[in-house]
């Protein structure tokens, strides 16, 4: 007996061939011997089965001895053994129809779980193997669960259902709602304008929701809201902004914030949260601000940084075109009685300069 696997909602063609390449009598019946369709004279006739309105045959191939049955808009309950009677012989074809669907909306927040459920006919014992767009392989039976979705899980998932050495492939489009980056750090000299950008890792026709940037300044004992906003059809409107600092926000996506001046008291880390309409939970992006200040006071030249820096970062004071350098894996370096000239303060990570500030030391006579 031949086994054919079908997908719920799809169309399947069950083939039946006569030895003579000519038009002849044929019938398709189900396992209960109820006629589905057949030929009477030159016409296709349909029996009283539940399939009658969805079953058809390729008349153009009859004179070649091909008497296939086409079933449209497959249902799980169409799974059955179908019998083709032609030239006094019977050909049996077992049709197994499977369905694979996501248990919830296919637009899911990062960190949420995805469950794929397999619908299968009674008595079948299929196995399912899914491959994510990022190449992650997950196997299961009737259900497949991905406990915590990541950005890279966005895209088309390919799932293969196997039964009796036959396979059928499903493609499910999953959109993971997340920011493009989990975290970003902005390095600025004191007084410079700061730009924070929060691009999304997805596009939606209509994007509506609300959000907030919550900030923990390194120097402050507690965190506070810097700005709250609404998003209506991709248009941003500010709801409330703190008086210090006076942030500005772009009116269009991507979400964009401007801090007029980088100051030591603003250095720290923030969390931008975005709630989307009809979704429970929020998208998050961490943002860090590191501020550098180089100052000369009396006989002391000092360079300081504020904000979240890793212990492996190096802070250096270097006299331009001279070898004089002082370096430390610390948040402040200084030189007593510095030579006159242009000094550079550098914040670097394994030789890569992240931030630099120049300060001119004038000779004292």
């Amino acid at each position: 007996k031949k086994v054919v696997l079908g997908k719920k909602g799809d169309t399947v063609e069950l083939t039946c061939n006569a030895s003579q390449k000519k038009n002849t009598q044929f019938h398709w019946k189900n396992s209960n011997q109820i006629k589905i369709l057949g030929i009477q004279g030159l016409f296709l006739t349909k029996g009283p089965s539940k399939l009658s309105d969805r079953a058809d045959s390729r008349k153009s191939l009859w004179d070649q001895g091909c008497f296939s049955m086409i079933i449209k808009n497959l249902k799980i309950e169409d799974s059955d053994t179908y019998i083709c009677e032609v030239e006094n012989k019977k050909e049996e074809v077992e049709l197994l129809v499977f369905g694979l669907t996501a248990n919830s909306d296919t637009h899911l927040l990062e960190g949420q779980s995805l469950t794929l459920t397999l619908e299968s006919p009674p008595g079948s014992s299929p196995s399912v193997k899914c491959r994510s767009p990022g190449g992650k392989n997950i196997q299961g039976g009737r259900t497949i669960s991905v406990p915590q979705l990541e950005r890279q899980d966005s895209g088309t998932w390919t799932c293969t259902v196997s039964q009796d050495q036959k396979t059928v492939e499903f493609k499910i489009d999953i959109v993971v709602l997340a920011f493009q980056k989990a975290s970003s750090t902005v390095y600025k000299k004191e007084g410079e304008q700061v730009e924070f950008s929060f691009p999304l890792a997805f596009t939606l026709e209509k994007l509506t929701g609300s959000g907030e940037l919550w900030w923990q300044a390194e120097r402050a004992s507690s965190s506070k809201s810097w700005i709250t906003f609404d998003l209506k059809n991709k248009e941003v409107s500010v709801k409330r902004v703190t008086q210090d600092p006076k942030l500005q926000m772009g009116k269009k996506l991507p979400l964009h914030l401007t801090l007029p001046q980088a100051l030591p008291q603003y250095a720290g880390s923030g969390n931008l949260t975005l709630a989307l309409e009809a979704k429970t939970g929020k998208l998050h992006q961490e943002v860090n601000l590191v501020v550098m200040r180089a100052t000369q006071f009396q006989e002391n030249l000092t360079c300081e940084v504020w904000g979240p820096t890793s212990p492996k970062l190096t802070l250096s004071l270097k006299l331009e075109n001279k070898g004089a350098t002082v370096s430390k894996q610390a948040k402040a370096v200084w030189v007593l009685n510095p030579e006159a000239g242009m000094w550079q303060c550098l914040l670097s990570d394994s030789g890569q300069v992240l931030l630099e500030s120049n300060i001119k030391v004038v000779p004292t006579w």
Epitope: T208, G209, S210, E212, W214, A220, S221, S222, K224, S225, T228, D230, K239, R240, T242, Q243, D244, T273, A275, E277, T280, G281, K282
Partner: antibody
Framework: EVQLVESGGGLVQPGGSLRLSCAAS????????MSWVRQAPGKGLEWVAN????????YYVDSVKGRFTISRDNAKNSLYLQMNSLRAEDTAVHYC????????????WGQGTLVTVSS | DIQMTQSPSSVSGSVGDRVTITCRAS??????LAWYQQKPGKAPKLLIY???SLQSGVPSRFSGSGSGTDFTLTISSLQPEDFVTYYC?????????FGQGTKVEIK
């Protein structure tokens, strides 16, 4: 530790006036919007008014507009509610509240002061 | 003004039960919704902000969901101290408004 302590409640006749005060400590008072929320005996919560960090913006519920005035003195870490033309329906415990929670939530509440308007 | 309608006005349960309180806004408020708990004779305490985020220090048996106009507060397993009153509040537009409250009572 954040602390909000209300005072100034008491018994007053209809048409009379009362000034509620709230002394704030444990946080940078001048960095937060502040609210007054009240609760009539055995009833639910009703937001009354709020004020911006520097006092430049004020909002009121319709039932108190023109009768109540919210103000603040950042130098004294104090919030005030001047209540004029008091009515029996103003009888309630009045809470001083900080609007410092994420997503504009009311994160710290005082213990409340009872205002009774009765003849 | 935005009307906030809480239901039910009271609910009975036993220790360990799961309880759900709903709050409906008369117009869309996105996620500008907070839930508060109030014990008799005490000031309210913030439980949930932004419709679904748990305030620091609040037990994880409390959870919030919803956006737009329909919101829920769920207590997954009632504890003896949870038999008090709960309020929802919108912060979408002035005046801020509260639901009428839901009293959780011992069965």
């Amino acid at each position: 530790e954040v602390q909000l302590v209300e005072s100034g409640g008491g018994l007053v006749q209809p048409g009379g006036s009362l000034r509620l005060s709230c002394a704030a400590s444990g946080f940078t008072f001048s960095s937060y919007w502040m609210s007054w929320v009240r609760q009539a005996p055995g009833k639910g919560l009703e937001w009354v008014a709020n004020i911006k960090e520097d006092g430049s913006d004020k909002y009121y519920v319709d039932s108190v507009k023109g009768r109540f005035t919210i103000s603040r003195d950042n130098a004294k870490n104090s919030l005030y509610l001047q209540m004029n033309s008091l009515r029996a329906e103003d009888t309630a415990v009045h809470y001083c509240v900080r609007e410092g929670g994420q997503w504009l939530a009311l994160d710290y509440w005082g213990q409340g002061t009872l205002v009774t308007v009765s003849s | 003004d935005i009307q906030m309608t809480q239901s039910p006005s009271s609910v009975s349960g036993s220790v360990g039960d799961r309880v759900t309180i709903t709050c409906r806004a008369s117009q869309g408020i996105s996620s500008w919704l907070a839930w508060y708990q109030q014990k008799p004779g005490k000031a309210p305490k913030l439980l949930i902000y932004g419709a679904s985020s748990l305030q620091s220090g609040v037990p994880s048996r409390f959870s919030g969901s919803g956006s737009g106009t329909d919101f829920t507060l769920t207590i997954s397993s009632l504890q003896p101290e949870d038999f008090v009153t709960y309020y929802c509040q919108q912060a979408n537009s002035f005046p801020w408004t509260f639901g009428q409250g839901t009293k959780v009572e011992i069965k």
